[in-house]
Amino acid sequence: QKYSQLLEKKTTKELVHTTLECVKKNMPVEETAWSCCPKNWKSFSSNCYFISTESASWQDSEKDCARMEAHLLVINTQEEQDFIFQNLQEESAYFVGLSDPEGQRHWQWVDQTPYNESSTFWHPREPSDPNERCVVLNFRKSPKRWGWNDVNCLGPQRSVCEMMKIHL
């Protein structure tokens, strides 16, 4: 069951997302709770995802997400990543919230989630260049698979934003 509803950002009365798509969750007591994502966002588990069609630098992509009260995608599980891959276009690359600011191969997620080398999804022979400090998801034809690739942060790419579901 879905419905649309205005969301007011309570602190500033600023309308950030004017339309939500909500799913009713059955609660143990008489109350009804709604779990919502902004219109045109994808819903998976406890998060909402926005897949951009415009290209921008990593820095501007991060700000574009912030303007929507979100952040660049932080990948926590294989399942989450597989869901994202299903919604991407194979001919494009998409910035995620992983970067190496100093070029020392010290990878950092934008939300401070610890970088775990054992649960990464780099393409073979990636990361390849310490001057490529930002990460994209892209599709390679041989072998046919999605994965991570390091790229120059100033090169424009599409991106994926993530936010927690809104509960009403």
Partner: antibody
Framework: QIQLVQSGPELKKPGETVKISCKAS????????MNWVKQAPGKGLKWVGW????????TYVDDFKGRFAFSLETSASTAYLQINNLKNEDTATYFC????????????WGQGTTLTVSS | DIQMTQSPASLSASVGETVTITCRTS??????LAWYQQKQGKSPQLLVY???TLADGVPSRFGGSGSGTQYSLKINSLQPEDFGNYYC?????????FGGGTKLEIK
């Protein structure tokens, strides 16, 4: 260490053209945007715009569109600011400044190039 | 465009005093704000970024604070080398405008 070294002072007449250089060293040039800032005598700082050093794409603030042009010589890690058809009000010190990796704030600055336009 | 209103335009203080400079923005810039110090005849130097993070090598008597549209730079126990001009600048959306500046003079 990281350095931005600018070309020397310029004295020009109205209508002439000037080209100011900013040579970067101590870091990978194409990883950081290069900004230009104007400071007229006794006045505050005005952002002129920046160049994406990876794509070469310039961005100009509206007030500086038309006569101002940014360019790059990537192999020499050098950025340029050219001002055409100089006017008296272009008299100022021009700074280049590196844009930080993530947030764009200006973490390193050149020493400034003083441009005087006078007939 | 985001407008930056910096105050005061000038300020006289003595060594050892504490001063505060403020910067008000016309829209929420979500802490995308930097503070710079500029001495006479020199290039500006980064003091604070992301509204409250001190740049490398900046003494701890400097401190940035604020959020939304209101930001401040506080200098505790002023030292002789602290006198000069101070500017705020936002990085939320282009153009990345500067505040008008604050001239900090010795009383």
């Amino acid at each position: 260490q990281i350095q931005l070294v600018q070309s020397g002072p310029e004295l020009k007449k109205p209508g002439e053209t000037v080209k100011i250089s900013c040579k970067a060293s101590g870091y990978t040039f194409t990883n950081y945007g290069m900004n230009w800032v104007k400071q007229a005598p006794g006045k505050g700082l005005k952002w002129v715009g920046w160049t994406n050093t990876f794509t070469g794409e310039p961005t100009y603030v509206d007030d500086f569109k038309g006569r101002f042009a940014f360019s790059l010589e990537t192999s020499a890690s050098t950025a340029y600011l050219q001002i055409n058809n100089l006017k008296n009000e272009d008299t100022a010190t021009y700074f280049c400044a590196r844009g930080n990796f993530r947030y764009y704030y200006f973490d390193y600055w050149g020493q400034g190039t003083t441009l005087t336009v006078s007939s | 465009d985001i407008q930056m209103t910096q105050s005061p335009a000038s300020l006289s203080a003595s060594v050892g005093e504490t001063v505060t400079i403020t910067c008000r923005t016309s829209g929420n810039i979500r802490n995308y704000l930097a503070w710079y110090q500029q001495k006479q005849g020199k290039s500006p130097q980064l003091l604070v970024y992301n509204a409250k993070t001190l740049a490398d090598g900046v003494p701890s008597r400097f401190g940035g604070s604020g959020s939304g549209t209101q930001y401040s730079l506080k200098i505790n126990s002023l030292q002789p080398e602290d006198f000069g001009n101070y500017y705020c600048q936002h990085f939320w959306s282009s153009p990345y405008t500067f505040g008008g500046g604050t001239k900090l003079e010795i009383k």
